[in-house]
Amino acid sequence: VPRWRQQWSGPGTTKRFPETVLARCVKYTEIHPEMRHVDCQSVWDAFKGAFISKHPCNITEEDYQPLMKLGTQTVPCNKILLWSRIKDLAHQFTQVQRDMFTLEDTLLGYLADDLTWCGEFNTSKINYQSCPDWRKDCSNNPVSVFWKTVSRRFAEAACDVVHVMLNGSRSKIFDKNSTFGSVEVHNLQPEKVQTLEAWVIHGGREDSRDLCQDPTIKELESIISKRNIQFSCKNIYRPDKFLQCVKNPEDSSCTSEI
């Protein structure tokens, strides 16, 4: 008789999750010499230990502390790029602008990017059938708590000028409920961070509006200003040209506004 299993509303753990995390860890530590000291088996053990045998709606940041310790990494604090609802372009940008880092360019972000995972209370099994959905089931699930934890730490580490890439095609360009809006904004340290510079990425070819005047951007400016951090905003009208000019800044067409 099959054992009763909790049915959650979200997709189950990504198939081959343990193998994927371990393989990503090995690959990352091979590519990044400063992380060669990392013991990937210990990293996997700590990752697994954060959620295995625990109720998937009762995960805490404490559960992830061993993983955080083992994955501790120093990135240049003045080269941090945050993003909201525009991950692909942010990653394309840091692949070209190699001295800037998104969270997914760090070991822990790289390990978990695009993966889903959860366990079951009191069993050592990984649940490949379903995992809790943040809205429909619970917010304290393994994936949400992981991203909340690493995002908080990433924002806390930032200094000087912090950049954030925002999606100008969305109805809420700045969304208070996004990870950026609910976690990262509130964990930037005013004593270290001088300015938050938003890059609003336009979607339409002929979109010449100044999206920096959008009400949600004004809301972001208000939140940031109240935290004693300066705010600036730039429209990126042509993201394709923007990336091209990052690759070839000496190109003559790159002197005009992008």
Partner: antibody
């Protein structure tokens, strides 16, 4: 019976060296992180250093970093603390403690040795 | 000076309930599990509470732990003379190179 038994303490001149040992018995030593904690006379507990189950990663208190080295030999079920450039302020009882298991269902120091005294 | 702040002393009469506080910050207690240790005179420390609230087997249920935000506390109910000891809280620190931090310790006297 789960047991930790420190040895290697003694009287040493400032600038000198000592190596503490802590053999473990009664549990799977290679499945636990291990930690050294010290206690100066009449003072509180002070964390010194921690090493992971595999020995692949270690952390040190600011007060000992660069002078002390934690290591382990899982084949001998033994934890070590090599102490160089010793100072008067390193005088203390040194305890070894079993720390986080590699299942990570808790992090705390749940088994302690009886301590060994280092006098500088 | 310890990263975690405990009152240096506490006292109570047999049968009473005593609480010992442990105050930290967002870089330690807030996001890490707290553990509590009892050290009887002349002996090694002993684990009383782990993961904020859990008791190891063999520890009487008179001992209980709690945590809220950047503070934690240890409660001892039905105080007994053998509870006279030093009590320490400990947690992990989020700093890059460190790991454990301890409170300065609280000397509990049973009157």
């Amino acid at each position: 019976e789960v047991q930790l038994l420190e040895s290697g303490g003694g009287l040493v001149q400032p600038g000198g060296s000592l190596r503490l040992s802590c053999p473990a018995s009664g549990f799977d030593f290679s499945s636990y992180w291990m930690t050294w904690v010290r206690q100066a006379p009449g003072k509180g507990l002070e964390w010194v250093s921690t090493i992971t189950d595999s020995g692949g990663r270690a952390w040190y208190a600011d007060s000992v970093r660069g002078r002390f080295t934690i290591s382990r030999d899982n084949s001998k079920n033994t934890l070590y603390l090599q102490m160089n450039s010793l100072r008067a302020e390193d005088t203390a009882v040194y305890y070894c403690a079993r720390d986080t298991p590699k299942t990570y269902y808790y992090y705390a120091m749940d088994v302690w040795g009886q301590g060994t005294t280092v006098t500088v | 000076q310890s990263a975690l702040t405990q009152p240096p002393s506490a006292s109570g009469t047999p049968g009473q309930r005593v609480t010992i506080s442990c105050s930290g910050s967002s870089s330690n207690i807030q996001y890490s599990y707290v553990s509590w240790y009892q050290q009887l005179p002349g002996t090694a420390p002993k684990l009383l509470i782990y993961n904020n609230v859990q008791r190891p087997s063999g520890v009487p249920d008179r001992f209980s732990g709690s945590k809220s935000g950047t503070s934690a506390s240890l409660a001892i109910s039905g105080l007994q003379s053998e509870d006279e000891a030093d009590y320490y809280c400990a947690t992990w620190d989020e700093s890059l190179l460190g790991l454990w931090v301890f409170g300065g310790g609280t000397k509990l006297t049973v009157l």
